[in-house]
């Protein structure tokens, strides 16, 4: 529990600590509080760097000191032989003895207090980003007109945030611009356009001021575009660096301007449009778009027809064409459809003859029908061959569809008869 | 057959066998079996076998056997009550259709039908073939397919043979257009048991093949000369009773 | 008028063997098909074989098999059934029977032979 | 072989009864099954072929039915005459098989 003052004494104090004795105390003020320690009675034996024993003040991970000795006090109006006083609430105060003392050391006593710290000018870095303001136990940041305290407490920001663009052109500059945007600023801009539009952003050169890169080429000051998974940017510099024309392949974009603390600069101004979302022109084989444009973007609508002899194979058997819908994703409907060559399926049996195994009953393909000679013929002619055609009947050049008839043939003996002479 | 040889089916693989009454037919197509209005006239659901040259039972059994779905007897041909006193054989023409498709083959097939044009109009001395397991010199009936090639006379060479057990008077006898005399020489001929087969002459447009230009039907006396049904007049009519009896399959 | 005359009774010894034959008179041989029939005492009838002319081979039920020869001499018109390796079991008449026509099995019949197999 | 099975083996009647035998055949005979009369001391005598063809003389109380494995034989009106020993046969097969027999006895 922390406290505001206390007293710490080697181990039987006034009389003399005893061998061997390692000894802490931890002391703790409230937050927002220095602690300031002083010794009022120093009586520990002495060595080189205080290694047999010695009273050790550590702060954190430093070691403030570490002492041994006699010590008196060089005022004659103050009683203090030695003091510590650390910006910091906490303090850890350790005493040792080793095996043996060759006199009688009686040891220490020391006193702490909470001290008041300015946080505002004892520290190397300045707690607040614009005005400090100390109190006894504490600190508060304030700003300058048309800043903000931001949420930590200690940064100013302008209000720069939040807007949402959702008309399909706009422009968007940084705050006050043409005037120097304000220091130490986040500013977070969205375009939200409707599904099926690309936000493309259109910068001029002359419209971008914003302060330069290090020397190891870090943007201070920097503007990015986040579409998605992909990022435009940082950007910053005297005149645009990047693309004059962005097009970001989505409805949806972040503008972030990041600003430090010095160097400010005109900053930026940028339009952007909506753009209907591109679907690529998809290498579709076996089939004609219907209309053929060299561009085609989002609700474009296509009727995809298959070449003679293609068909669409998926559920709707026998298809010959389909429709695709350039989509708000940029991506074609129905894009899993697909011209196949037709396939007239195994070829039917006839009575009487037979048709060999097809290696292929797709389109194009040919197949030949004979008859069981020589007891067998095909009457209807055709000659028994047929090809598969684009309706996907196996198709006969005289008899079309129609298959081949095996019809006896009729009169013809085996073996003639020889009469036997008797 | 009488005067005849012996003949192996192969020689004659539209011939069909029927065993009640025993008697024969022509095999026309894989449907349709041809014979005499008098075989089937008594028996419309008759037993028919092809592709063996025995009639053995043996044979008979390891043989194709047909099963009518219908007979069809020419409407010009008279129904008797008493047909063994029939002295009428004009229009002696049926057909029978089958209950299921003949498979053909080396034993079985049928034989052609003859053209309309006067090609296929036979002159004597033209040559056929008859065949059957009829009568013959030695038996009543022949175990073997016997086969004999005769010559188309006259029809006036048939009147003049005496009927040898004539059931009426011998003017009663009717002799018509419809039918070829054929026979006459070394005593072959066609005889009971071989009714219904064929007479086949050579395709005159195609010599390869054989057509039935007749029907064995009636004779006066067995070796002496016979009278056949002429197809040739009835190609009309089997064509349309086998259009119209046929399954769409078919057509 | 078509007959079968069959050879007389024989009397045989277990292990010997028997020819039974059968005259056709009336017709020729080579237009039949010979079967034989056996019939032991107070037994049924049992189908030996019979020789195929339109296949040219002799065929014989299983039962015979290997012990059974069927013969026919054209010129004599006469058909022959030998039994070999006799057992008392083979004591039957045996008949020779010619083959019908058109369904009918059995035409005509023989007499029979009565073979008597005993020690 | 073709395995012939007739029942039953013995059957007791009386003039003017209406007797059946039954025959199974051990596969499909189709309609090849002929039926046979025998007397003692005498050669079988053919009554019935194909099943139910009946052979010329035979009288017509006689009558056979069936066809592939099942067969019966039946003789509508048993007559003194008919007291014999029945058999049935096939011939589909080139291997001929009679079946054991029926003895038909007066009762």
């Known amino acids: 529990e922390p406290t505001m003052y206390g007293e710490i004494l080697s181990p039987n104090y006034p009389q003399a600590y005893p061998s061997e004795v390692e000894k802490s105390w931890d002391i703790e003020v409230p937050e927002g509080y220095g602690i300031h320690l002083y010794f009022t009675h120093l009586d520990i034996e002495l060595s080189e760097n205080c290694a047999y024993d010695s009273v050790q003040i550590i702060s954190g991970d430093t070691e403030e000191g570490r002492l041994c000795g006699q010590r008196s006090s060089n005022n004659p109006h103050s009683p203090i032989v030695e003091e510590f006083q650390v910006p910091y609430n906490k303090l850890q105060v350790i005493f040792k003895s080793d095996f043996s003392n060759e006199e009688r050391f009686t040891g220490f006593a020391a006193y702490y207090v909470a001290t008041d710290i300015n946080e505002c000018t004892d520290f190397v870095d300045v707690p607040c980003s614009h005005f400090c303001n100390n109190f006894i136990g504490g600190y508060f940041c304030s700003c300058p007109p048309e800043y903000f305290l931001h949420d930590d407490m200690k940064n100013c920001g302008v209000n720069c945030s939040g807007d949402v663009f959702t008309a399909l052109i706009g422009e968007i500059a940084s705050p006050n611009y043409p005037k120097p945007y304000p220091e130490n600023s986040r500013c977070e801009y969205q375009i939200r356009l409707e599904k099926g539009f690309q936000v493309v952003v259109t910068l001029r050169r002359e419209d971008f001021d914003v302060e330069a890169a290090d020397s190891a080429g870090n943007c201070l000051d920097s503007l990015v575009f986040v579409a998605g998974d992909r990022q435009f940017g940082p950007y910053c510099g005297h005149g645009f660096p990047g693309p004059l024309n962005i097009e970001t392949k989505s409805n949806a974009l972040d503008i972030i301007f990041q600003t430090d603390l010095t160097g400010q600069k005109k900053g930026w101004k940028l339009r952007y449009h909506g753009d209907p979302m591109p679907c690529p022109k998809e290498d579709t084989p076996n089939s004609v778009w219907e209309p053929a444009k060299a561009k085609y973007v989002f609700r474009d609508v296509v009727q995809i027809t298959c070449l003679d002899g293609f068909e669409v194979v998926e559920g709707r058997v026998g298809a010959t064409s389909f429709y695709s819908t350039c989509q708000s994703n940029g991506k074609w409907s129905n894009s899993k459809l697909k011209c196949q060559p037709v396939d007239c399926g195994i070829p039917e049996s006839i009575e009487n003859g037979k048709v060999e195994d097809p290696e292929s009953t797709l389109f194009g393909s040919v197949i030949r029908y004979t008859c069981e000679e020589p007891y067998y013929y095909m009457e209807n002619g055709g000659g028994g061959e047929y090809h598969c055609a684009g309706n996907g009947s196996w198709v006969n050049e005289v008899l079309g569809p129609e298959l081949p008839k095996c019809v006896p043939v009729c009169g013809v003996p085996r073996e003639p008869f020889e009469e036997k002479q008797r | 057959i009488i005067g005849g040889s012996d003949a192996d089916i192969k020689n004659f693989p539209w011939q069909v066998f029927f065993d009640n009454p025993w008697a024969g037919g022509a095999l026309i197509n894989e449907y349709w079996v041809l014979t005499a209005a008098h075989v089937v006239e008594g028996n419309r659901e008759p037993t028919m076998y092809v592709g063996s040259t025995s009639v053995q039972t043996s044979r008979l059994a390891k043989s194709k056997m047909l099963t009518p779905e219908h007979v069809f007897i020419h409407p010009g041909w008279k129904l008797l009550e008493v047909p063994e006193g029939r002295t009428n054989f004009d229009n002696d023409i049926a057909l029978v259709r089958l209950k299921d498709p003949v498979k053909m083959g080396p034993t079985v097939s049928p034989i052609c039908l003859p053209g309309t044009s006067s090609d296929y109009n036979l002159m004597d001395g033209d040559l056929g073939l008859i065949s059957g397991w009829g009568r013959t010199e030695k038996r009543d009936r022949a175990v073997r397919l016997k086969a004999a090639r005769l010559p188309v006379a006259p029809l006036r060479k048939c009147k003049e043979v005496k009927v040898e057990k004539p059931t009426a008077d011998a003017e009663a006898y009717v002799f018509t257009p419809n039918m070829i005399c054929a026979g006459g020489e070394k005593g072959m001929d066609s005889c009971k048991g071989d009714s219904g087969g064929a007479f086949a002459v050579q395709d005159p447009n195609d010599k390869t093949k054989f057509y039935a230009a007749g029907l064995v039907s009636w004779g006066p006396q067995c070796g002496t000369y016979g009278l056949y049904t002429r197809v040739k007049n009835y190609v009309d009519w089997i064509m349309k009773t086998m259009q119209e009896n046929s399954t769409p399959r078919e057509d | 008028e078509v007959q079968l005359v069959q050879s007389g009774a024989e009397v045989k010894k277990p292990g010997a063997s028997v020819k039974v034959s059968c005259k056709v008179s009336g017709d020729t041989l080579t237009e039949l098909s010979m079967h034989w029939v056996r019939q032991a005492p107070g037994k049924g009838l049992e189908w030996m074989g019979t020789f195929d002319p339109e296949e040219g081979e002799t065929i014989y039920a299983q039962k015979f098999q290997g012990r059974v020869t069927m013969t026919e001499d054209t010129s004599t018109d006469t058909a022959y059934m030998e039994l070999s390796s006799l057992r008392s079991e083979d004591t039957a008449v045996y008949y020779c029977v010619t083959e019908g026509l058109a369904g009918v099995p059995f035409d005509l019949w023989g007499q029979g032979t009565l073979v008597t197999v005993s020690s | 072989d073709i395995q012939m099975t007739q029942s039953p083996s013995t059957l007791s009647a009386s003039v003017g009864d209406r007797v059946t035998i039954t025959c199974r055949a051990s596969?499909?005979?189709?309609?090849?099954l002929a039926w046979y009369q025998q007397k003692p001391g005498k050669a079988p005598k053919l009554l019935i072929y194909k099943a139910s063809s009946l052979e010329s003389g035979v009288p017509s109380r006689f009558s056979g039915s069936g066809s592939g494995t099942e067969f019966t034989l039946t003789i509508s009106s048993l007559q003194p005459d008919d007291f014999a020993t029945y058999y049935c046969?096939?011939?589909?097969?080139?291997?001929?098989?009679f079946g054991q027999g029926t003895k038909v006895e007066i009762k």
């Open positions: 596969q499909s005979i189709s309609s090849w």
């Open positions: 046969q096939q011939h589909n097969s080139y291997r001929w098989t």
